[in-house]
Interface confidence: low
Amino acid sequence: AVNGTSQFTCFYNSRANISCVWSQDGALQDTSCQVHAWPDRRRWNQTCELLPVSQASWACNLILGAPDSQKLTTVDIVTLRVLCREGVRWRVMAIQDFKPFENLRLMAPISLQVVHVETHRCNISWEISQASHYFERHLEFEARTLSPGHTWEEAPLLTLKQKQEWICLETLTPDTQYEFQVRVKPLQGEFTTWSPWSQPLAFRTKPAALGKDT
């Protein structure tokens, strides 16, 4: 048996994936554990093997179907269990009645591209990935721009309070290399959190025209 405090946290990507992290102080690193998902009103159930991500935490992804298939709705409740092998039997380590649309974390935005770049501004667009059609307009975004000599943590956050998959960055410095990231969050869900940040998009502003003030 393992003692110590444990935490079991899962998020639904709004389509066909539930990602889970289980942490347990004092657990043995080589313990074999799984997450079992049992929906209350579906015929399927699913299992994934928890793999170590740090000294005392494990993670896995419950793949519920094709990436863009709508496998759960708001009225679903999924019983999630952490099962760890103890000798010849499995022991229930954690259990959660999981409401998928109260625990949302979407996939990071994809397909970032520079639509138009000038000396002082840059227009960037992106796409959301594997987001439920149910959300329609009810999404918000945060974006950040990495300037030379700064870190991502220092970058001010730009908030887009609507489903707007583009941004026009202003007051940029000419002939300067920047990087840009964006993340997305549904408006719904008590425990909903931001998606991971997108892959950074690198771009360079155009040089100022010779003989002109910048």
Epitope: T74, H133, Y134, F135, E136, H138, P186, L187, Q188
Partner: nanobody, 123 residues
Framework: EVQLVESGGGLVQAGGSLRLSCVAS????????MGWFRQAPGKEREFVGI????????DYADSVKGRFTITRDNAKSTVYLQMNNLKPEDTAVYYC????????????????WGLGTLVTVSS
Amino acid sequence: EVQLVESGGGLVQAGGSLRLSCVASGRTFSATNMGWFRQAPGKEREFVGIISESGRNTDYADSVKGRFTITRDNAKSTVYLQMNNLKPEDTAVYYCALGRDYFATDTRQYNYWGLGTLVTVSS
């Protein structure tokens, strides 16, 4: 201020049909999601179904799936609940509610409520 007014309730025999209407006034109706809830005597208010702002997406409680249909007419600021094959256990006061988020089955997620319309299904 938003106002929601339900109508169409009444007494119907088991197996019969009713169509409830909910008219919204006081704000842009087309930019909101609308839910139907019901409350039977001595019970908590429960989710019946919901329709998204465009009307393309709907969701229903298991107990009414296949029997009830929600539609909306944004030009008339009205949402409808078509109830077929009614059962005595469908007897309740039916409320429409206006909420910001599509997937809201919890009454706490709704800001505005109508006063309700009574549906009685006799056996």
